[in-house]
């Protein structure tokens, strides 16, 4: 048994450009606080798998209020540090999930709002009793600080709090095969005490009064030799004639693991899987309970009053996840309109609307042409939020105020010759063309390529482009 | 105060069909994007299909093809025709409204109906 120790050092913005906003403000006060989560092994789980080596919540930082114009500075922390316990042997190996929540602080109907601002993980190998780790890890633009340790509770010594100490029985020395335990060595290593009659040989023990065997030995008291051959049945005990295994209780029947947890067959034992909130060599033990308020969002607690019992979260509608800290995407049913950016504040959701556009959600077209003149007899035309004017001929420009050129665009085809005209522009045609842009080629019998000349036209005159 | 009241849900046989209706009730209130929602057991509640605040239909990709979503403005109710169901459907489906009330915009979802695919 031990505890496990988690120190935030700092939790602020990281170095390099794009420092986060403050996650608090003048309107919105918030206080941080943050949930430490541990799984044995260096398993790389979902975050929403089990902390079945425990979880911690730390107490509320100190209330936070940003200095307007001021960078994110570092922010203000909890006091303390953050305790899980463990009941068994310390792993060595361990992943962990570190999350930074914000509790906001403003008017929120219903109480405080919380949101998670960060959420940091990693896997480490870690020796009980050694001294502080010290760690760096990043989230987006922020960065946490800390520092973590392993350590036993006593009797529990070792890098796994698995050997146990007692008071030396004499002053000068321990007993026949028994260590000082270092560090305290006014101490000596206690026995474990195994089931009566396990064997010295093949046989241990990591809990009092349990007989666990090595490979190759079976039976209650690993007395029992695991023969090689074939045989019918894979496990024990031995029939004495042939040292062939016949049916015998297996380390799961009758199923060693509390709690509703499954049982597995190791090669040396049997493994529990434990469900939610509990962990534990038989999933004895539960982490958490509905007194560390597990349940963020709102959500309402249910069972888990004392360490042995589960704790279920019933979420509130737009919320989820087995501690209702993750959000329902409310913005993926597109609520905005005009192309307008959701955003889910949880208390609410919001638009940021395009240019042109406003109202709650983007809904209303801003009248882009009141008091806006369009010049020289220009309309003015709305449309995408934008206005623009449609000027009359020979006008230009964004308000028609400047004079048009007709022939800037070089208007007439096949080398016509293009005049200005009051009412637009006139194309005089190179030999061979003729139309109002000098479009349509003139076919050498004198028929042209269109289907009749308006009359008063011969070809090769100027066409007047109306 | 708007309510949504989801029916239709059940159990039914791969590749099978099931039609979801959704109807909305309440005073005084106009509706800018409804749809839905489904969370399969131990999992997340993501969007399946939706009427966008711009009317535009959206569907996640997994159901696209399989599943149609149509409404009835007349009686504020939304369908979701759903066919060539597979296991990976099963899941409680929850109709989810955005809704204008006066000059507010509020959240609503139904209780949820539960739909099973097995064989």
């Known amino acids: 048994a031990g505890v496990f120790e988690l120190q935030i050092h700092s939790f602020g913005p990281g170095p390099g450009p794009g420092a986060p906003r403050s996650p608090c403000s003048a309107r919105l006060p918030c206080r941080l606080f943050f949930r430490v989560c541990l799984k044995p092994g260096l398993s790389e789980e979902a975050a929403e798998s089990p902390c079945a080596l425990g979880a911690a919540l730390s107490a509320r930082g100190p209330v936070y209020t940003e200095q307007p114009g001021a960078p994110a500075p570092d922010l203000p922390l909890p006091d303390g540090l953050l305790q899980v316990p463990f009941r068994d042997a310390w792993p060595g190996t361990f992943s962990f999930i570190i999350e930074t929540w914000r509790e906001e602080l403003g008017d929120q109907i219903g109480g405080p709002a919380w949101s998670l601002l960060a959420r940091v993980a990693g896997r480490r190998r870690l020796a009980a009793g050694g001294p502080w780790a010290r760690d760096i890890q990043r989230a987006g633009a922020w960065e946490l600080r800390f520092s973590y340790r392993a350590r036993c509770e006593p009797p529990a010594v070792g890098t796994a709090c698995t050997r146990l100490c007692r008071p030396r029985s004499a002053p000068s020395r321990c007993g026949p095969g028994l260590r000082p335990c270092a560090p305290l060595e006014d101490e000596c290593e206690a026995p474990l005490v195994c089931r009566a009659g396990c064997s010295p040989e093949h046989g241990f023990c990591e809990q009092p009064g349990e007989c666990r065997c090595l490979e190759g030995w079976t039976g209650p008291l690993c007395t029992v030799p695991v023969s090689t051959s074939s045989c019918l049945s894979p496990r024990g005990p031995s029939s004495a004639t042939t040292g062939c295994l016949v049916p015998g209780p297996g380390p799961c029947d009758g199923n060693p693991c509390a709690n509703g947890g499954s049982c597995s067959e190791t090669p040396r034992s049997f493994e529990c899987t434990c469900p939610r909130g509990f962990y534990g060599l038989r999933c004895e033990v539960s982490g958490v309970t509905c007194a560390d308020g597990p349940c963020f969002n709102g959500g309402l607690c249910v069972g888990g009053a004392d360490p042995d019992s589960a704790y279920i979260c019933h979420c509130p509608p737009g919320f989820q996840g087995s501690n209702c800290e993750k959000r329902v995407d409310r913005c993926s049913l597109q609520p905005c309109r005009n192309g307008g950016l959701c955003l889910d504040l949880g208390h609410a959701l919001r638009c940021r609307c395009r240019a042109g556009f406003a109202g709650p959600r983007c809904e209303h077209d801003l009248d882009d042409c009141a008091g806006r003149a369009c010049a020289n007899g220009g309309t003015c035309v709305e449309g995408g939020g934008a206005h623009r004017c449609s000027c009359a001929l020979g006008f230009g420009g964004r308000d028609c105020r400047e004079r048009a050129d007709p022939c800037a665009a070089r208007p007439c085809a096949h080398g016509g010759r293009c005049y200005a005209h009051f009412s637009g522009l006139v194309c005089a045609c190179a030999p061979g063309y003729m139309g109002a842009r000098c479009e349509f080629p003139v076919h050498p019998d004198g028929a042209s390529a269109l289907p009749a000349a308006p009359p008063g036209l011969r070809p090769g005159d100027p066409q007047r482009y109306l | 105060e708007v309510q949504l009241v989801e029916s239709g849900g059940g159990e039914v046989q791969p590749g099978g069909s099931l039609r979801l209706s959704c109807a909305a009730s309440g005073s005084d209130f106009s509706i800018n994007a409804i749809g839905w929602y489904r969370q399969p057991p131990g999992k997340q509640r993501d969007m399946v299909a939706g009427?966008?605040?711009?009317?535009?239909?959206t569907y996640a990709e997994s159901v696209k093809g399989r599943f149609t979503i149509s409404r009835d403005n007349a009686k504020n109710t939304v369908y979701l025709q759903m066919s060539s169901l597979r296991a990976e459907d099963t899941a409680v489906y929850y109709c989810?409204?955005?809704?204008?009330?006066?000059?507010?915009?509020?959240?609503?979802w139904g209780q949820g109906t539960l739909v099973t695919v097995k064989p």
């Open positions: 009427f966008t605040g711009d009317g535009v239909t």
């Open positions: 989810a409204a955005d809704v204008k009330i006066g000059g507010d915009y509020e959240w609503f």
